[in-house]
Every structure is written in C-alpha cells, then in structure tokens.
Interface confidence: medium
C-alpha cells in the first residue's frame, strides 16, 4: 500500500506478482515528488496496491482502463 | 528459460490424499501467480485453485473448497496442490500453470501435468 | 456460475480459415483468452485479452471479441493446427476462471 506523507501518496515497494486485470477498479499515479515512480491500483476490494509502472502488465492494464 | 517442473505420476486409493508439487525455475515464484487446473480424461480444462495476490489468500473454486489445499514454499520456489477424499472423479491430469505478467493475467507458462489416478 | 459456450468440433481443409468461437453473457469489457493443446500435451497460450498473440504463436492466428461472443481465427490452417482449442475468462462476480467446453478442430 502507498504510505502518505502529509496528502502525497508514495509507494517504496511494488507488487511482485500480476493482479489480475478484473481486480482493478481504478488507478492513479503518485506524484512526482516521491522518491519511486509508481501506479496506485485501487482494487475491488478497495485496496491500493502499488506497482512498478514499467512492467508490462501494468502498462496493459492502464491502457485497458483507459479505454473502458 | 522459465519452467514449471511439476511432480511425477500419483496411483492413489478412494479416499486417501495426493500432494502434486510444482517447481518454478529461472524466476522467482513470488514474481510469479500459480494456478492449478486439472483435466479429467477426455475431458476439458477445469481451473480449480490460485492465490490472490492482493492478499496471499488461496481462492478455491466451489467444487475443490474444503477438500482442496494450496500452498507455496517461497524458499525452494515450489507450489503445492493437495487434494483429499479422494474418488475415481478426481482421476486426472493436474497443471500448474502461472502468470508472469508478460500477457496481462493469461496463463502463461504451463507445466507437463501430473496425473493422478484414484482406483481400488 | 459463469459459462463459455463453445462447439464441440470444428472441421477445415488445409489453406482454409478456421473460426473457433465462445459464446458468453456480456463478454464485452472482459479480456477473452485462448489456448490451444495438442494431442498429449500442455496447453499453450495462444492469443491473450481477446486479440494479442502470444510470442511465438505466427501470425495466422488472430482473435477477436464482439461482445457476446469471441472468436479465434486460424488463416492458412496447417494440419499442425489440429488441437483442442479453450477460451477463458475471468468471471468477476464468483472470482474464479472459467474455461469454455473445448472445440476440436481437425485438419481434413
């Protein structure tokens, strides 16, 4: 999960496995101020999950969600 | 290159229990989702079991619930399927079959299959 | 719970198109996936999330999902080709997988 240092989200690990993709309802990306780039996946267990927007999966899925 | 290097042949009684491991090598199973699906013969794929990422809880499909198990040993890289209470139904070809992430969350990588025959 | 709907068999002479298809409700929105499986062996990812091949698979196959059913595409069917097919699906509302009934297809 993100840790939020006063309203700016930050994730310093990612997810090491692929969620899978109907888990997902929603993603954002964390600001630029935190130290690891990082998408926020909010899940359908309104979860946020943090994972590493260079793996393709992740890349995949916010294509996915863009377009629904 | 990255395999899943599952168990060899099972011959089990009505009513005992079988153990079916599956390997992962050249990756890391924690980067890894493991499902296991099995194939009775002459019959289609039926999926049976997965653990959630989000959580590490394992998901059972209706069927397998209460009498299925699956578990993971992250420090040999190893999967594990066991079933109980077995009956000639059971007999089959269990996959493991993984997500790597590389085609969103399609399995994958498959392993040879182990198959498990239940008979008196 | 979720059910994919496929034809038991389909038949095609070589050089000709095969189309597999997977009847489900309300496919649309959900990423189709097929497998092909040989005659003793594993099955095999062939196209993933209804329309992108797998590495590896050549380009004959295509995939395509219209919204209550998907369809594999085989172009220039090769006697090779001749396997059981599966679609699957994610079926959000039991959280499982859940595969077609298979569709044989055979090279005349």
């Known amino acids: 999960s993100p840790y939020s240092s006063d309203t700016t989200p930050c994730c310093f690990a990612y997810i090491a496995r692929p969620l899978p993709r109907a888990h997902i309802k929603e993603y954002f990306y964390t600001s630029g101020k935190c130290s690891n780039p990082a998408v926020v996946f909010v899940t359908r267990k309104n979860r946020q999950v943090c994972a590493n927007p260079e793996k393709k999966w992740v890349r995949e899925y916010i294509n996915s969600l863009e377009m629904s | 290159q990255v395999q899943l290097v599952q168990s060899g042949a099972e011959v089990k009684k009505p009513g005992a229990s079988v153990k079916v491991s599956c390997k992962v090598s050249?990756?890391?199973?924690?980067?890894?989702?493991i499902h296991w699906v099995r194939q009775a013969p002459g019959k289609g794929l039926e999926w049976m079991s997965y653990?959630?990422?989000?959580?590490?809880?394992?998901i059972y499909a209706q069927k397998f619930q209460g009498r299925a198990t699956m578990t993971e040993d992250s420090s040999t890289d190893t999967a594990y399927m066991e079933m109980g209470s077995l009956t000639s139904d059971d007999t089959a070809v269990y996959y493991c079959?993984?997500?790597?992430?590389?085609?969103?969350?399609?399995?994958?990588?498959w392993g040879r299959g182990t198959l498990v025959t239940v008979s008196s | 719970s979720y059910v994919l709907t496929q034809d038991p068999s389909v038949s095609v002479a070589p050089g000709q198109t095969a189309r597999i298809t997977c009847g489900g409700a309300?496919?649309?929105?959900?990423?189709v996936h097929w497998y092909q499986q040989k005659s003793g062996q594993a099955p095999v990812l062939v196209v993933s999330?209804?329309?992108d091949r797998a590495s590896g698979i050549p380009e004959r196959f295509s995939g395509s999902n219209s919204g209550t059913t998907a369809t594999l595409t085989l172009s220039r069917v090769e006697v090779g080709d001749e396997a059981d097919y599966y679609c699957?699906?994610?079926?959000?509302?039991?959280?499982?997988?859940v595969f077609g009934g298979r569709t044989k297809l055979t090279v005349l």
């Open positions: 050249g990756y890391a199973l924690s980067e890894l989702s």
């Open positions: 699957q699906v994610w079926d959000s509302s039991s959280d499982h997988w």
């Open positions: 653990i959630d990422p989000e959580d590490g809880e394992p």
């Open positions: 999330d209804n329309s």
């Open positions: 309300n496919l649309w929105g959900l990423g």
């Open positions: 079959a993984g997500v790597t992430g590389s085609t969103s969350d399609a399995f994958d990588l």
